[in-house]
């Protein structure tokens, strides 16, 4: 190859040599590598203002390897792509672009949303909740006895949390008032509180019983209607009358 160095060859071609270093098959003083040994990839390396050919076993970031018969080269990924598998398949986009099916997009297609952590277009995920649990026993202050009006609760789990553009999750608990046939607490259940309850029974009967637990999302309200309040007042009056008869004292009662 180097044998002939006629006028035409000097004009047309830089000095080509096969006594090269670092993976070059052919090289020149001015250009560095011209071609590479088998399985190595040619790439132009920018050194200051100069570009010289080098031969590498794998391509640098921003390039992918192209193989043709006896000639391999590192080829630049597309302008918006940082790392690619081949010309048409990007695996990491440059800043400000989102990856979708191997392409780099400045905004995600309809039905998809940008994940700003992975810089990928991902499917919009809506919240998914489980079925409601059964209602809990009717309780008041952690007890299921010694009262007539209490609250019961049911819950559900979040099976799938939503993505940024997904539907928000519904409430995970629901509470409502409940009325039970009043039963006395057994000795074990009563304890100190049970004895106190006996002493304060009359006062407690007078006290208005309320219950609440409505989620911020606005589920069932436990506020009583005017009819319910009127009923309650009647019941309380009847109870007072019965006590008054027992005490053999006469009182005048006014109906509200």
């Amino acid at each position: 190859q180097n044998a002939s160095r006629g006028r035409r060859q000097r004009r047309m071609h830089p000095n080509v040599s096969q006594g090269c270093q670092g993976g070059c098959a052919t090289c020149s003083d001015y250009n560095g590598c011209l071609s590479c040994k088998p399985r190595l990839f040619f790439v132009l390396e920018r050194i200051g203002m100069k570009q010289i050919g080098v031969c590498l076993s794998s391509c640098p970031s921003g390039y992918y390897g192209t193989r043709y018969p006896d000639i391999n080269k590192c080829t630049k990924c597309k302008v918006d792509c940082d790392t690619c598998f081949n010309k048409n398949f990007c695996t990491k986009c440059k800043s400000g672009f989102y990856l979708h099916l191997g392409k780099c997009l400045d905004s995600c297609p309809e039905g998809l949303e940008a994940n700003n952590h992975t810089m990928e277009c991902v499917s919009i995920v809506h919240c998914e909740a489980s079925e409601w649990s059964p209602w809990s026993p009717c309780m008041k202050k952690g007890k299921t006895c010694g009262f007539k009006r209490g609250t019961e609760t049911r819950v559900r789990d979040i099976l799938q949390h939503p993505s940024a553009k997904g539907n928000l999750c519904p409430p995970t608990s629901e509470t409502r008032t409940c009325i039970v046939q009043r039963k006395k607490c057994s000795k074990g259940e009563r304890g100190k509180k049970g004895r106190e309850r006996k002493r304060k029974k009359l006062n407690k009967e007078e006290r208005k019983e309320t219950s609440s637990s409505s989620d911020s999302k606005g589920l069932e309200s436990s506020i009583e209607t005017p009819d319910q309040q009127e009923n309650k007042e009647r019941q309380q009056q009847q109870k007072r009358r019965a006590r008054d008869k027992q005490q053999k004292s006469v009182s005048v009662s006014t109906v509200h």
Epitope: Q1, A3, S4, G6, Q9, M12, H13, P14, V16, Q18, A25, T26, C27, S28, N31, G32, C33, L34, S35, C36, F42, L44, Q51, I52, G53, T66, Y68, P69, D70, I71, K73, T75, K76, K78, V79, K87
Partner: antibody
Framework: EVQLQESGPSLVKPSQTLSLTCSVT????????WSWIRKFPGNKLEFMGY???????YYIPSLKSRVSITRDTSKNQYYLQLNSVTTEDTATYYC?????????????WGQGTLVTVSS | DIKMTQSPSSMYASLGERVTITCKAS??????LSWFQQKPGKSPKTLIY???RLIDGVPSRFSGSGSGQDYSLTINSLEYEDMGIYYC?????????FGAGTRLEIK
């Protein structure tokens, strides 16, 4: 001095095979890449393919089914065969060489041979 | 295939004039671009490779520049012997492809 010289028939009948030879002096075909290029009457240049220093070949997709490039290292010659020619294959055929991506592509050309496809 | 769009397709210029021919690739070709000159009845002759590297023996009035998709060949002061057809070639990717050519004639 590296020189390339094309030879072969200047007239080929449609449906026949076009066969050309490129004789190389001043360099060995066991080094570098040895190509065929053609120039159509409207001045359009088309690269057709190459045979490498080891004898491996590359053909452009549009010609792959009917082109073949072979070589004879003992004669330092390489060859072009184009099957099932039509009048569209009328062109000046050149052989040319290059040494790789870091150097000039097609630094050396043959003088070209005009092949007319006509019945 | 990468398409090379060369312009103008033909031009007339005066001796001593500065002439510029451009080539636009359909995608980034990373500086793998050559320029050729072909005169009537002759084979093409390489002028420039890797965008801006002048072949030994080519007059210094020829220069090349560009990057990405856009490249140009400039003849600083046109001489009579510069008439002919000029072609660009991309060799970033196979199949390598040529521009359609620019016919340069002297006014």
């Amino acid at each position: 001095e590296v020189q390339l010289q094309e030879s072969g028939p200047s007239l080929v009948k449609p449906s026949q095979t076009l066969s050309l030879t490129c004789s190389v002096t001043g360099d060995s075909i066991t080094s570098g890449y040895w190509s065929w290029i053609r120039k159509f009457p409207g001045n359009k240049l088309e690269f057709m393919g190459y045979i490498s220093f080891s004898g491996k070949t590359y053909y452009i997709p549009s010609l792959k089914s009917r082109v073949s490039i072979t070589r004879d290292t003992s004669k330092n010659q390489y060859y072009l065969q184009l099957n099932s020619v039509t009048t569209e294959d009328t062109a000046t055929y050149y052989c040319a060489t290059y040494h790789g991506y870091g150097g000039p592509w097609f630094a050396y050309w043959g003088q070209g041979t005009l092949v007319t496809v006509s019945s | 295939d990468i398409k090379m769009t060369q312009s103008p397709s033909s031009m007339y210029a005066s001796l001593g004039e500065r002439v510029t021919i451009t080539c636009k690739a359909s995608q980034d070709i990373d500086s793998y671009l050559s320029w050729f000159q072909q005169k009537p009845g002759k084979s093409p002759k390489t002028l420039i490779y890797l965008t801006n590297r002048l072949i030994d023996g080519v007059p210094s009035r020829f220069s090349g520049s560009g990057s990405g998709q856009d490249y140009s060949l400039t003849i600083n002061s046109l001489e009579y012997e510069d008439m002919g057809i000029y072609y660009c070639l991309q060799y970033d990717e196979f199949p390598v492809t040529f521009g359609a050519g620019t016919r340069l004639e002297i006014k």
